[in-house]
């Protein structure tokens, strides 16, 4: 089975690599524009130059192309705690990241939020914090993991998942309460 190609891919595949088919004359292959530039005018004929112009400030193209407009530079989202790692250039989009001791959580493919790495208080670090993953903590006895923090078993209610981890403590508390009644 031949995979379905979009119109643009079909047109491009007729020409050698680095060239594209002229939109008005499919017998002409024009040279693509270099990264950092965009297509201003198609080449007038075979072997003639494509008119490519440099992207204006605030826009970029990161690969060879025949785009009629450069792409708008991304902005780092302050409300998500993002900081600029490197600014936008004509051939590279803005790179956004997180501060030291923070990790990225991706809510969707193109949206991340920065959160502080867990310190594993009342526990030990099982896996260190990474760029896209929080610290993995192992809690000390008498503590259970809730929202990646080690919480005292005294805060464990019977209906919660923590009952398995805190069972001895819960039994002790129950036993202490029972022994006080006469």
């Amino acid at each position: 089975l031949v995979p379905h190609l979009g119109d643009r891919e079909k047109r491009d595949s007729v020409c050698p690599q680095g060239k594209y088919i002229h939109p008005q004359n499919n017998s002409i292959c024009c040279t693509k524009c270099h990264k950092g530039t965009y297509l201003y005018n198609d080449c007038p004929g075979p072997g003639q130059d494509t008119d490519c112009r440099e992207c204006e400030s605030g826009s970029f193209t990161a690969s060879e192309n025949h785009l009629r407009h450069c792409l708008s530079c991304s902005k780092c989202r302050k409300e998500m705690g993002q900081v600029e790692i490197s600014s936008c250039t004509v051939d590279r989009d803005t790179v956004c990241g997180c501060r030291k001791n923070q990790y990225r959580h991706y809510w969707s493919e193109n949206l991340f939020q920065c959160f502080n790495c867990s310190l594993c208080l009342n526990g030990t670090v099982h896996l260190s914090c990474q760029e896209k993953q929080n610290t993995v903590c192992t809690c000390h006895a008498g503590f259970f993991l809730r929202e990646n923090e080690c919480v005292s078993c005294s805060n464990c209610k019977k209906s919660l998942e923590c009952t398995k981890l805190c069972l001895p403590q819960i039994e002790n508390v129950k036993g202490t309460e029972d022994s006080g009644t006469t």
Partner: nanobody, 119 residues
Framework: EVQLLESGGGLVQPGGSLRLSCAAS????????MVWVRQAAGKGLEWVSH????????FYADSVKGRFTISRDNSKNTLYLQMNSLRAEDTAVYHC????????????WGQGTLVTVSS
């Protein structure tokens, strides 16, 4: 106590429009980034849109870009989602929420309003 109450959901035909509202109380609304998320039956939560406190430069998921508009009225403590050109795949329960701060979970979100897109 933080309270978020959504309204405006309902049954609408494909191509139709709805405007969701979220009435907020129990916190300083004007200081918080607000979020719309949705959950279709049997699926996980999907981030739809969010809007910073000043209302500038809202974010939209690719699936709703150009069709949905998020807005807020800080004087009324209310968040809105204008939904146009609705599609069957927009059918879900829509929740408004405060942007999480401590970690990747929602501490505060409403019970939701059901949007059904069907002919």
């Amino acid at each position: 106590e933080v309270q978020l109450l959504e309204s405006g959901g309902g049954l609408v035909q494909p191509g139709g429009s709805l405007r969701l509202s979220c009435a907020a109380s129990g916190f300083t609304f004007a200081h918080e980034t607000m979020v719309w998320v949705r959950q279709a039956a049997g699926k996980g939560l999907e981030w739809v849109s969010h809007i910073p406190p000043d209302g500038q430069d809202p974010f939209y998921a690719d699936s709703v870009k150009g069709r949905f508009t998020i807005s807020r009225d800080n004087s009324k403590n209310t968040l809105y989602l204008q939904m146009n050109s609705l599609r069957a795949e927009d059918t879900a329960v829509y929740h408004c929420a405060l942007l999480p701060k401590r970690g990747p979970w929602f501490d505060y979100w409403g019970q939701g309003t059901l949007v059904t897109v069907s002919s």
